[in-house]
Interface confidence: low
């Protein structure tokens, strides 16, 4: 039985040209986290494998940095980075848990005026 829950940074906005940390946290389970996949829509951004370490997809190497922890740092943000991001926790023996984050990248003037999404 899967008892765990994924907590995420929810819906976030960030400034164009800046950076953002995507964070997920798995709680309420004693399952062993074996791997975390970070995906944007259908694209794999990065993998953190408990045994074999981090792997960043080649097309994102220049703009994606591992960490902190199991999180992911996106740098040099562009408007095209707006969209859904998923953290996929592979665990043993529970199976797979998925968390969702929606990121909107805003022009400086908008971001500076505190536009934020409401987390439902």
């Amino acid at each position: 039985m899967m008892t765990g829950t994924i907590e995420t940074t929810g819906n976030i906005s960030a400034e164009k040209g800046g950076s953002i940390i995507l964070q997920c946290h798995l709680s309420s389970t004693t399952a062993q986290v074996t791997q975390v996949n970070w995906e944007q829509q259908d694209q794999l951004l990065a993998i953190c494998n408990a045994d074999l370490g981090w792997h960043i997809s080649p097309s994102f190497k220049d703009r994606v940095a591992p960490g902190p922890g199991l999180g992911l740092t996106l740098q040099s943000l562009t408007v095209n980075d707006t969209g859904e991001y998923f953290c996929i926790y592979h665990t043993y023996p529970d199976g797979t848990y998925t968390g969702r984050i929606f990121l909107e990248v805003l022009e400086s003037s908008v971001a500076e005026h505190g536009a934020r999404f409401q987390i439902p």
């Epitope: 074996t34 996949n37 494998n49 408990a50 045994d51 074999l52 043993y92 199976g95 797979t96």
Partner: nanobody, 125 residues
Framework: QVQLAESGGGSVQTGGSLRLSCEAS????????MAWFRQAPGKERERVAA???????AYADSVKGRFTISKDNAKTTLYLQMNNLKPEDTAMYYC???????????????????WGQGTQVTVSS
């Protein structure tokens, strides 16, 4: 049913090369860790190299820079290219696979997963 069959072993001189192959049947293209282990007489079986379903790799310190693990595109054959072989590389080499979540390799240990029968590698000075 997963079945693994190793080949490519043999006898070589120090500094020589061998390429081991492991034909895998019944292994899904995703979700598997595959690895090479070796066991020398009187010693414990040790993991030489591992590759996840996402093509992440890990090597034992003793073989780094000399051995390369890889899979074919269909992910049904595992390889171990062994260069600059040393007498201490002499052992029986085993192919192993495990369907750990996300291709995780940490659970693949002797006594778990699927194993081939092994192929002998002998390096003489």
């Amino acid at each position: 049913q997963v079945q693994l069959a190793e080949s490519g072993g043999g006898s070589v001189q120090t500094g020589g090369s061998l390429r081991l192959s492991c034909e895998a049947s019944g292994v899904a293209a995703s979700g598997y860790c595959m690895a090479w282990f070796r066991q020398a007489p009187g010693k414990e079986r040790e993991r030489v190299a591992a590759i996840s379903s996402n093509d992440l790799v890990a090597y034992a310190d003793s073989v780094k820079g000399r051995f390369t693990i890889s899979k074919d595109n269909a992910k049904t054959t595992l390889y171990l290219q062994m260069n600059n072989l040393k007498p201490e590389d002499t052992a029986m080499y085993y192919c192993a696979a495990d369907g750990g979540y996300g291709g995780y390799c940490g659970r693949l240990r002797p006594g778990t997963g699927y194993w081939g029968q092994g192929t002998q590698v002998t390096v003489s000075s």
